[in-house]
């Protein structure tokens, strides 16, 4: 009798622990990655930003992986993804090649199983940064809710990377898991 | 035997209630604060906005505190923070002194233990608001995922506060807890 | 004795399942709706966008309903709402009626019990899209945390809908439930 009770309790405990593990102890994945200013590429066309901090300042990561400039999903789920990208120019930096600029961000998802890349979110603006002003600034913010599978990779592409603001509060992207896939 | 069973059940119930309390009954903190238009400061440089509604219209708060113009964290955790700031000018609003404006928001974290302030997020744009148009408008949105400790304070700084749109749907900031710190 | 134990276990299991159902098995509602480009209205004033995809590409919905151009809440709770709206014009699209544009988004909540509509969030910018540039682009992002009741409806209004970017990564809105109402 006593063994039977213990076995039943173990079942209850087991299922409780399973829930606990899934909902509480198995920490939900997240990442907040800030731009690595020492390694910003040049160019005016769309380029992928591959250098981000995940372990200093506001940069952090848990149950996701950062590798080869991409944020890799380790756990299936629905995630909220976001990016904040700031561009700036001061007249002391030198003359702009053109006053008409297309300042854009693209948040892309790459599946390694099926080698293909898709843009999840885009944002930005065309700007006229005239010589009449000594300083110019512009920020883009995008965010959205997406189904991500383990092994999929998130990356950031921008136009005019040489104009990026290198501060950690200015140029960053991130993700956090909101819920499981049914 | 019966007492032993009850004791074991109490243990199961105890741990279940603990989980329930943590994951469900101990409500996750959040806040959504809307601008108090009756008390917008003047100035052109970065100024702190200290007057926000937390208990009327869309304004609300739970398990966080609003005091002295700052949103105070009461529970350690990872939070998603966001801000939406709208600026506007109509020719009837007053004599605008310059067409060249820097419209910016800074979301800052202050630690009272170590008296220091750090910018978590910034956004905005330089704008040319010419007299050729009778109305001008611009909005900024920023958001990000941050580790916050109990006692830390979140505040909002903006440039050109007299240009703020005073509507509750226009100028607001908020936070909600996503998960515990491991 | 054995029946008594089973009854007690059933009570534990029942309450555990109740928690599990609420926190895990009863999936949290969400939606990510992308613009249906085949059905964008014309006009320059504020119009409601009623045609969105919820079941193709990045579009998805769960435990919410999309009907008559509105996202309907099925479950009381606190939700994070967001919208990303992109506007664009290329000189090949034809001449703009005016170079001075007000590019705006309004995220509105409608209660059918009390027939009234309220703007939860707004964003945008006045823009000068001159003929000196062959292409113009601008994106708006808004997001915020709101209490929504079952039966309430979320809709999107924009100015200048004919300038909307029809890509699924450009013009979308969504919501996900973060927590229950206490």
């Amino acid at each position: 009798g006593s063994q039977h009770i213990r076995a039943e309790k173990a079942m209850v405990d087991g299922s409780w622990l399973d829930l606990a593990k899934r909902s509480k102890l198995e920490a939900q994945p997240f990442a907040h990655l800030t731009i690595n200013a020492t390694d910003i590429p040049s160019g005016s066309h769309k380029v992928s930003l591959s250098s981000w901090y995940h372990d200093r300042g506001w940069g952090k990561i848990s149950n996701m992986t950062f590798s080869n400039g991409k944020l890799i999903v380790n756990q299936d789920g629905f995630y909220y993804l976001y990016a904040n990208i700031c561009f700036r120019h001061h007249e002391t930096s030198g003359d702009l090649a053109t006053e008409y600029l297309q300042l854009m961000v693209y948040v892309t998802k790459t599946s390694i199983k099926i080698p293909s890349s898709h843009t999840l979110m885009k944002g930005g603006s065309t700007k006229y940064w005239s010589g009449n002003s000594e300083f110019h600034f512009y920020s883009i913010n995008v965010g959205g809710f997406f189904k991500l599978r383990s092994g999929e990779e998130i990356s950031i592409e921008v136009s005019n990377p040489s104009l990026l603001d290198p501060d950690q509060d200015a140029t960053y992207f991130g993700a956090f898991k909101v819920r499981d896939i049914d | 035997g019966s007492q032993h069973i009850r004791a074991e059940k109490a243990m199961v119930d105890g741990s279940w209630l603990d989980l329930a309390k943590r994951s469900k009954l101990e409500a996750q903190p959040f806040a959504h604060l809307t601008i108090n238009a009756t008390d917008i400061p003047s100035g052109s440089h970065k100024v702190s906005l200290s007057s926000w509604y937390h208990d009327r219209g869309w304004g609300k708060i739970s398990n966080m505190t609003f005091s002295n113009g700052k949103l105070i964290v009461n529970q350690d955790g990872f939070y998603y923070l966001y801000a939406n700031i709208c600026f506007r000018h109509h020719e009837t609003s007053g004599d605008l002194a310059t067409e060249y404006l820097q419209l910016m928001v800074y979301v800052t974290k202050t630690s009272i233990k170590i008296p220091s302030s750090h910018t978590l997020m910034k956004g905005g744009s330089t704008k040319y608001w010419s007299g050729n148009s009778e109305f001008h408008f611009y909005s900024i949105n920023v958001g990000g995922f941050f580790k916050l400790r109990s006692g830390e304070e979140i505040s909002i700084e903006v440039s050109n506060p007299s240009l703020l749109d005073p509507d509750q749907d226009a100028t607001y900031f908020g936070a909600f807890k996503v998960r515990d710190i491991d | 004795g054995s029946q008594h134990i089973r009854a007690e276990k059933a009570m534990v299991d029942g309450s555990w399942l109740d928690l599990a159902k609420r926190s895990k098995l009863e999936a949290q509602p969400f939606a990510h709706l992308t613009i249906n480009a085949t059905d964008i209205p014309s006009g320059s004033h504020k119009v409601s966008l009623s045609s969105w995809y919820h079941d193709r590409g990045w579009g998805k919905i769960s435990n919410m309903t999309f009907s008559n151009g509105k996202l309907i809440v099925n479950q009381d709770g606190f939700y994070y709402l967001y919208a990303n709206i992109c506007f664009r014009h290329h000189e090949t699209s034809g001449d703009l009626a005016t170079e001075y544009l007000q590019l705006m988004v309004y995220v509105t909540k409608t209660s059918i019990k009390i027939p009234s509509s309220h703007t939860l969030m707004k964003g945008g910018s006045t823009k000068y899209w001159s003929g000196n540039s062959e292409f113009h682009f601008y994106s708006i992002n808004v997001g915020g945390f709101f209490k929504l009741r079952s039966g309430e409806e979320i809709s999107i209004e924009v100015s200048n809908p004919s300038l909307l970017d029809p890509d699924q990564d450009a013009t979308y809105f969504g919501a996900f439930k973060v927590r229950d109402i206490d």
Epitope: N132 | S42, G43, S44, S93, G94, D95, L96, A97, T98, E99, Y100, L101, Y128, S130, G131, N132, N160, S162, L163 | -
Partner: antibody, heavy 122, light 107 residues
Amino acid sequence: EVQLVESGGGLVKPGGSLRLSCAASGFTFRNYAMSWVRQAPGKGLEWVAGISSGGTYTYYPDTVKGRFTISRDNARNSLYLQMNSLRAEDTAVYYCARRDYGDVYEWYFDVWGTGTTVTVSS
Amino acid sequence: DIQMTQSPSSLSASVGDRVTITCKASQDVRTSIAWYQQKPGKAPKLLIYSASYRYTGVPSRFSGSGSGTDFTFTISSLQPEDIATYYCQQHYSSPWTFGGGTKVEIK
């Protein structure tokens, strides 16, 4: 040295016109809103016109609206006041004044010229 | 338009005296008040802005206070070089208006 120098004052008959100039030096003129402030003999100060840093906004009190026009040439670091339909009560010393940085809607003046005298008399 | 009423219109004080001038606005101007000094035959000079902020290079004996409609300008210890007419100006809303002035003389 930050300096404002007015010129163009003189004697003019009622109903006549006059154009005042102000030459700015020692600061980045294009970054500042500017104003004209006048002072009638033995009287106080009266603001008569203002212009935004880029020159697209102009402001006047009712006393001169429609008669006076303020303008600027940022390339030449110059401010102007075109005065038409002059009256005896427009007789004053006219000062060119730089608006200090501050709230975009608030105007006070941190740099003043030495003034130029306008006399309206028949 | 906002009217600015300054008092007294003139005053006489000794070197080292504390001198106080008041300015009353016809409506609430928050703290948007500036104070100027004008010596005979010269242009005005900005001393105080936003009611209490001393402009760059202005000696600490000059101070301002007040908010709403009532404002005070103080010279803590009058010096011979302070002989001048002092004006208040509201910078709250256009048109920008000045007080009538207070002439300060030495006894």
